[in-house]
C-alpha cells in the first residue's frame, strides 16, 4: 500500500501528445507504473511507461499518433489512469477525466530567426509547432530578451495578445550580443498554461557607424 498524497497532472499539446507527471509522497521503489489513456469517443487507447524524474515523481508522454495528426477534439474526454504493478496485477493509483482542450500546453515555438538587424533594433520571426486547427488565430505569445549582465528571470516580458509570429525589438544597444526567447499559449482552456520557452536565439546588433552620435 502507498501512503501520502498523490498528484497527477497532464497536458495536451493540442495534436497527438499528452504529457503527464505523477507525484507520490510515499515513493514507490522498483515498481513498474504506467499511464493509460482511454478516450470516450475514439477507437484507440494508449499507454506510456512512467519514468522517474525525481525522488517522488514520474513522467511520461502518451504518443497518440503522428506529431501533426489531430487525435482529439474539443468534445472529447479521456480517462487517464496511473496503474502500478502489484504482484501479478495492476493497481489504479490515480484517475482523472481529462478534458484535453481545457488542459493545453503547446510545444515551444521553433525556427526562430533574425529577419533584419540594425544598430538599435532587430526583427525576429518564429513558427508554432504542432498547434491544432481549432485555435485559428486565438493564440498569444510572450517574449523576453537577455541583455548582457542580466539573467533570464530579470528580463522584462513582452506580451503579444494575438497570433503574431514576429517581433521588432527596439531600443537595443549597438554592437551588443543578445539572446531572445518566445513562448505561446492558446486562449482556450481553464487549466491551459504557457508552452516551454523556445530555444534561445543569439543575435548581435550592428555597430554604430563611425563618426555618428549614438
Amino acid at each position: 500500500a502507498v501512503n501520502g498524497t498523490s498528484q497527477f497532472t497532464c497536458f495536451y499539446n493540442s495534436r497527438a501528445n499528452i504529457s503527464c507527471v505523477w507525484s507520490q509522497d510515499g515513493a514507490l521503489q522498483d515498481t513498474s507504473c504506467q499511464v493509460h489513456a482511454w478516450p470516450d469517443r475514439r477507437r484507440w487507447n494508449q499507454t506510456c511507461e512512467l519514468l522517474p524524474v525525481s525522488q517522488a515523481s514520474w513522467a511520461c508522454n502518451l504518443i497518440l499518433g503522428a506529431p501533426d495528426s489531430q487525435k482529439l477534439t474539443t468534445v472529447d474526454i479521456v480517462t487517464l489512469r496511473v496503474l502500478c504493478r502489484e504482484g501479478v496485477r495492476w493497481r489504479v493509483m490515480a484517475i482523472q477525466d481529462f478534458k484535453p482542450f481545457e488542459n493545453l500546453r503547446l510545444m515551444a515555438p521553433i525556427s526562430l530567426q533574425v529577419v533584419h538587424v540594425e544598430t538599435h533594433r532587430c526583427n525576429i520571426s518564429w513558427e508554432i509547432s504542432q498547434a491544432s486547427h481549432y485555435f485559428e488565430r486565438h493564440l498569444e505569445f510572450e517574449a523576453r530578451t537577455l541583455s548582457p549582465g542580466h539573467t533570464w528571470e530579470e528580463a522584462p516580458l513582452l506580451t503579444l495578445k494575438q497570433k503574431q509570429e514576429w517581433i521588432c525589438l527596439e531600443t537595443l544597444t549597438p554592437d551588443t550580443q543578445y539572446e531572445f526567447q518566445v513562448r505561446v499559449k492558446p486562449l482556450q482552456g481553464e487549466f491551459t498554461t504557457w508552452s516551454p520557452w523556445s530555444q534561445p536565439l543569439a543575435f548581435r546588433t550592428k555597430p554604430a557607424a563611425l563618426g555618428k552620435d549614438t
Partner: antibody, heavy 116, light 107 residues
C-alpha cells in the same frame, strides 16, 4: 453482437411530446456515447444530441431550443429521447446510434408522425 | 455550425466502375470525417471513420481520403449491392453535421 433496438412508430398531435427508446445489447452500455439523429422527408440527416451513459453527461443541438431531452436507464441498458412541443416538421424517422469514432452501430429507426 | 457539401447529389454508374464522391466542409475539420451507406428503407451503416479508417466488416473496395476541408470517398469497383445513398458527416465539433447525401444508381 452489438444491437440497438428502438421502440415502435408513433403518431402524435401538434403540441404533444414523444419519447423514443433505444435498448442496447452486446457491449458495455456505460462505456460509449449514444447519439440521436433524425431524418425528415426531403431533409438532410440532423444530429439532435448525445449522452454518455456512464456519467449522464449530455450535449444538445441548439436548433432544438430545449425541446429535446436525452436520458438513460443504465439498469435496463436503454437510452431515451424525448421531443416536446411537436410540430408537423418534426415528422421524421428518429435513430439512435452508438458513437465510437463515427456512429458505428445504428438502431432500426422509429417513425414519428405529427399530424392533426 | 459546420456546413457539409457533397457532390454529386446523384450519380449513375456501371458495375465494375470506379465511383468517387466528394465532401467539402465549410471550415477545417482535420480528419474528423465519416462516411455512411443507407439502402432504401434501411438504417445507416458506417463505412469509413476518421477519413480513411475502414469499419469492421466493410469490404476493401470502399476507401476514403482527404484532410482539412476536402474529402473523397471511393468505391474501386462498383457492385450491384452498393446501390444506396451515401452520406458524409463531421465529428470535429458539436453540432455534428451531415452532407445532403449522394444517391448512387446502376446504369
Amino acid at each position: 453482437q452489438v444491437q440497438l433496438v428502438q421502440s415502435g412508430a408513433e403518431v402524435k398531435k401538434p403540441g404533444a411530446s414523444v419519447k423514443v427508446s433505444c435498448k442496447a445489447s452486446g457491449y458495455t452500455f456505460t462505456s460509449h456515447w449514444i447519439t440521436w439523429v433524425r431524418q425528415a422527408p426531403g431533409q438532410r440527416l440532423e444530429w439532435m444530441g448525445d449522452i454518455y451513459p456512464g456519467s449522464g453527461n449530455t450535449n444538445y443541438n441548439e436548433k432544438f431550443q430545449g425541446r429535446v431531452t436525452i436520458t438513460v436507464d443504465t439498469s435496463a441498458s436503454t437510452a431515451y429521447m424525448e421531443l416536446s412541443s411537436l410540430r408537423s416538421e418534426d415528422t421524421a424517422v428518429y435513430y439512435c446510434a452508438r458513437e465510437r469514432g463515427g456512429f458505428d452501430y445504428w438502431g432500426q429507426g422509429t417513425l414519428v408522425t405529427v399530424s392533426s | 455550425d459546420i456546413q457539409m457539401t457533397q457532390s454529386p447529389s446523384s450519380l449513375s454508374a456501371s458495375v465494375g466502375d470506379r465511383v468517387t464522391i466528394t465532401c467539402q466542409a465549410s471550415q477545417d475539420i482535420s480528419n474528423f470525417l465519416n462516411w455512411y451507406q443507407q439502402k432504401p428503407g434501411k438504417t445507416l451503416k458506417l463505412l469509413i471513420y476518421y477519413t480513411s479508417g475502414l469499419h469492421t466488416g466493410v469490404p476493401s473496395r470502399f476507401s476514403g481520403s482527404g484532410s482539412g476541408t476536402d474529402f473523397t470517398f471511393t468505391i474501386s469497383s462498383l457492385q450491384p449491392e452498393d446501390i444506396a445513398t451515401y452520406y458524409c458527416q463531421q465529428d470535429n465539433n458539436h453540432p455534428y453535421t451531415f452532407g445532403q447525401g449522394t444517391k448512387l444508381e446502376i446504369k
